[in-house]
């Protein structure tokens, strides 16, 4: 049973003889008169397990202590470490030329744990060694124990295992503790990259090249890799890894941003707030959830605030000049937190009876500088219809309008265009012709333009070539023309007025007086 | 809830471990915190355990102090106690919303004297 | 680790009056708002009034009022009570390390 010794976190302890309780039992040659296992107490008093020679007297002394057998476990180059007391033959009468002052360390690697001899050729010699300082018999008085400690180290190893060898050649000798440990790179973390036990290469200037892994919620930047040292020190970090998103460095290690926190990158930032008018409900976000009525734009970027829709204008002025109109308004009072507002108009004409019964305005309306994406808070619209209902309403939108589901963003003014003259009839009809008379009917312009107050009917004969012509007023869209004389050509032009003037003549309409009474329709053309 | 047990009178230089007892949440979601006041002082934060089970010490604390847990409990072992280390012991819930404590235990009153 | 250096050791106040307590930290702390406030009465656990440096902890009266950024935070107990009376402690945190502030004593007079 082993009892537990600390020892540097770099070292892997394969032996340890002051940790074996009860009796070592190594093999000594020859059995007896040799090395002798004696227990002894430490400067704790706790016992311990020791193994002494002092046969000094005789000469040819050659006593081997062979250890158990050691295993390798993938160690390929182990160190030795001996701590032990030795006399100073000086201090020892009438040894002259028999008594030594050091001893001899073998080794011998063997796939077989269970060599019962000692056999002196098999071993190979690791060193001779000699004590740095040696006790005289004052200091057994004194109770001194002057403890001398050596490291040596043999490699590489190929087999599974090894045994130790002390050759004692006539010194006098307490082995007080055997320690064969080798040494790795202890498991490690660096740069968010996690690093294994390395065990120490071959030869004392080796370095072991170790590839680390990422830790947890990491992934590589560059490959992470360290290289693991002769004395178990790592050395020359490469590469790193970063927290994924979501993540964060702490100690070490990768962890989940808190709730109300994001990370949207693999970097090597930390997390941040959520940013205002957004949150996040579980730990580990990538990017935080746009409060109610907040949102965020698809080239937003994560760290941007949630915005919203700006509320409508304010201030809607409207400016008629006959078929034009100018509008101006103020800025919203709320842009929604963001800078890319702008503006739309939206015309619409309404009929005068109903104005809730409104239809687009269509292509034939112009606006300057343009109708959507407006910058300035102005806008002039025209090729407008004199004398319509007009509705025109200003959106304001910015980045994220298209996602508010219950828009409220616009401000409206309804106006009426001016009056103008109106357009030319465009049907002039010759309902019934007799030998005196011609009955007209026609239809409205297509632009009245106004109120139509009346209209004026001009005719004359063909031949008199407008050189003579005589006029008609009526309020209605038909009139009977008397007084004409038979079998004659004329010539009838309609025009209506609003009280901004008369429109244009409509296009000439011929008819021939008959002798026989006849109803026949014009169609603005010529008739006979 | 949190509830500190095992301080008591000791010697300096014996190892004492003081434990944390957790109850109505789980110690796989928050870390925890040892925080300790002298008598008549302020509060010192002594280290934490993370949910992984990795830990991390003021540096102060380093060598000093070893935190440990097992699925309902958290330790913190002082490993040579001076008279210095003579305190009232809170253990401490880091919060999974901001970076501070929620949650602390009564305390445990630790003497350390010969 | 970042050092907290708070002020004053000691405010007196009446009831019903304000005392303001100042916390200074030697760096900006974590997200330039990571700083919490404690109230500690005599043999109690510390009692956590304001986190994220002004956001109030549930059940703690609209009277603590936290605010600041970066390295200099303030604790502002208005309408003084008589219960108000104990010790303060800020906290900040910044990379990987917390600290508390050395306390702030409140007496309500």
């Known amino acids: 049973v082993t009892g537990s010794r600390v020892y540097p976190a770099n070292e892997v302890t394969l032996l340890d003889s002051r940790s074996v309780q009860g009796e070592l039992g190594w093999i000594a040659s020859p059995l007896e008169g040799g090395w002798e296992e004696v227990s002894i107490m430490d400067e704790k008093n706790t016992p311990i397990r020791t193994y002494q020679v002092c046969n000094v007297m005789e000469p040819s002394q050659n006593n081997w202590l062979r250890t158990d057998w050691i295993t390798r476990e993938g160690a390929q180059r182990v160190y030795i470490e001996i701590k032990f007391t030795l006399r100073d033959c000086n201090s020892l009468p009438g040894v002259m030329g028999t008594c030594k002052e050091t001893f001899n360390l073998y080794y011998y690697e063997s796939d077989n744990d269970k060599e019962r001899f000692i056999r002196e050729n098999q071993f190979v010699k690791i060193d001779t060694i000699a004590a740095d300082e040696s006790f005289t018999q004052v200091d057994i008085g004194d109770r001194i124990m002057k403890l001398n400690t050596e490291i040596r180290d043999v490699g590489p190893l190929s087999k599974k295992g090894f045994y130790l060898a002390f050759q004692d050649v006539g010194a006098c000798i307490a082995l007080v503790s055997v320690r064969v440990f080798y040494k790795k790179c202890p498991l490690t973390v660096r740069n968010l990259a996690q690093f294994p036990d390395t065990i120490t290469g071959a030869d004392t200037s080796s370095l072991v090249e170790v590839r680390g892994s990422c830790v947890n919620n990491s992934e590589e930047k560059d490959v992470p890799k360290m290289y693991c040292g002769a004395d178990g020190e790592w050395l020359v970090p490469i590469g790193n890894c970063l927290c994924n998103a979501g993540h964060e460095e702490r100690s070490g290690e990768c962890q989940a941003c808190k709730i109300g926190y994001y990370k949207a990158l693999s970097t090597d930032a930390t997390c941040a707030k959520c940013p205002p008018h957004s949150y996040s409900v579980w730990e580990g976000a990538t990017s935080c959830t746009c409060d109610r009525g907040f949102f965020r734009a698809d080239n937003d970027a994560a760290s941007m605030p949630c915005t919203r829709p700006p509320s409508a204008p304010l201030n809607l002025i409207s400016n008629v000049n006959e078929t034009s109109v100018n509008l101006e308004w103020s800025s919203p009072q709320n842009t929604g937190g963001r800078q890319d507002i702008s503006y739309n108009v939206v015309c619409k004409k309404c009929g005068a009876g109903d104005p809730s019964k409104c239809r687009p305005c269509g292509s034939g309306v112009h606006y300057t500088p343009q109708q959507n994406g407006l910058k300035t808070t102005k806008v002039s619209i025209t090729d407008l219809l004199a004398h319509t209902n007009y509705t025109f309403e200003i959106w304001a939108v910015n980045g994220v309008s298209k996602y508010n589901p219950n828009p409220d963003q616009s401000v409206s003014v309804t106006v009426t265009t001016n009056q103008a003259a109106p357009s030319s009839i465009a049907l002039v009809q010759a309902k019934e012709v007799t030998r005196y008379s011609v009955a007209l009917a026609w239809l409205e312009p297509d632009r009245p333009n106004g109120v139509i107050l009346e209209y004026e009917v001009k005719y004359y004969e063909k031949d008199q070539n407008e050189r003579s012509y005589r006029i008609v007023r009526t309020a209605a869209r038909n009139t009977d023309i008397k007084g004409l004389n038979p079998l004659t050509s004329y010539v009838f032009h309609v025009r209506a007025r609003t009280a901004a003037g008369y429109g244009d003549f409509s296009e000439p309409l011929e008819v021939t007086t008959n002798t026989v009474p006849s109803r026949i329709i014009g169609d603005g053309a010529n008739s006979t | 809830s949190l509830e500190e047990s095992g301080g008591r009178l000791v010697t300096p230089g014996t190892p004492l471990t003081l434990t944390c007892t957790v109850s109505?949440?789980?110690?796989?979601?928050?870390?925890m915190s040892w925080v300790r006041q002298a008598p008549g002082k302020g509060l010192e934060w002594i280290g934490i355990?993370?949910?992984?089970?990795n830990t991390y010490y003021a540096n102060w604390a380093k060598g000093r102090f070893t935190i440990s847990k097992t699925s309902t409990t958290v330790d913190l072992k002082i490993t040579s106690p001076t008279t210095e280390d003579t305190a009232t012991y809170f253990c401490a819930r880091e919060s999974s919303t901001f970076y501070g404590m929620d949650l602390w235990g009564p305390g445990t009153l630790v003497t350390v004297s010969s | 680790a970042i050092k907290m250096t708070q002020t004053p050791s000691s405010v007196s106040a009446a009831v019903g009056g304000t005392v303001t307590i100042n916390c200074q930290a030697s760096q900006s702390v974590y997200g330039n708002n990571e700083l919490a406030w404690y109230q500690q009465k005599p043999g109690q656990p510390p009692k956590l009034l304001i986190y994220t440096a002004s956001s109030l902890a549930s059940g703690v009266p609209s009277r603590f009022k936290g605010s600041g950024s970066g390295t200099e935070f303030t604790l502002t107990i208005s309408d003084l009570e008589c219960a108000d009376a104990a010790t303060y402690y800020c906290?900040?945190?910044?990379?990987?390390?917390?600290?508390f502030g050395g306390g702030t004593e409140v007496v309500v007079k």
């Open positions: 906290l900040g945190y910044k990379s990987d390390d917390y600290t």
């Open positions: 355990i993370y949910r992984s089970g």
């Open positions: 109505g949440f789980s110690l796989s979601s928050y870390h």
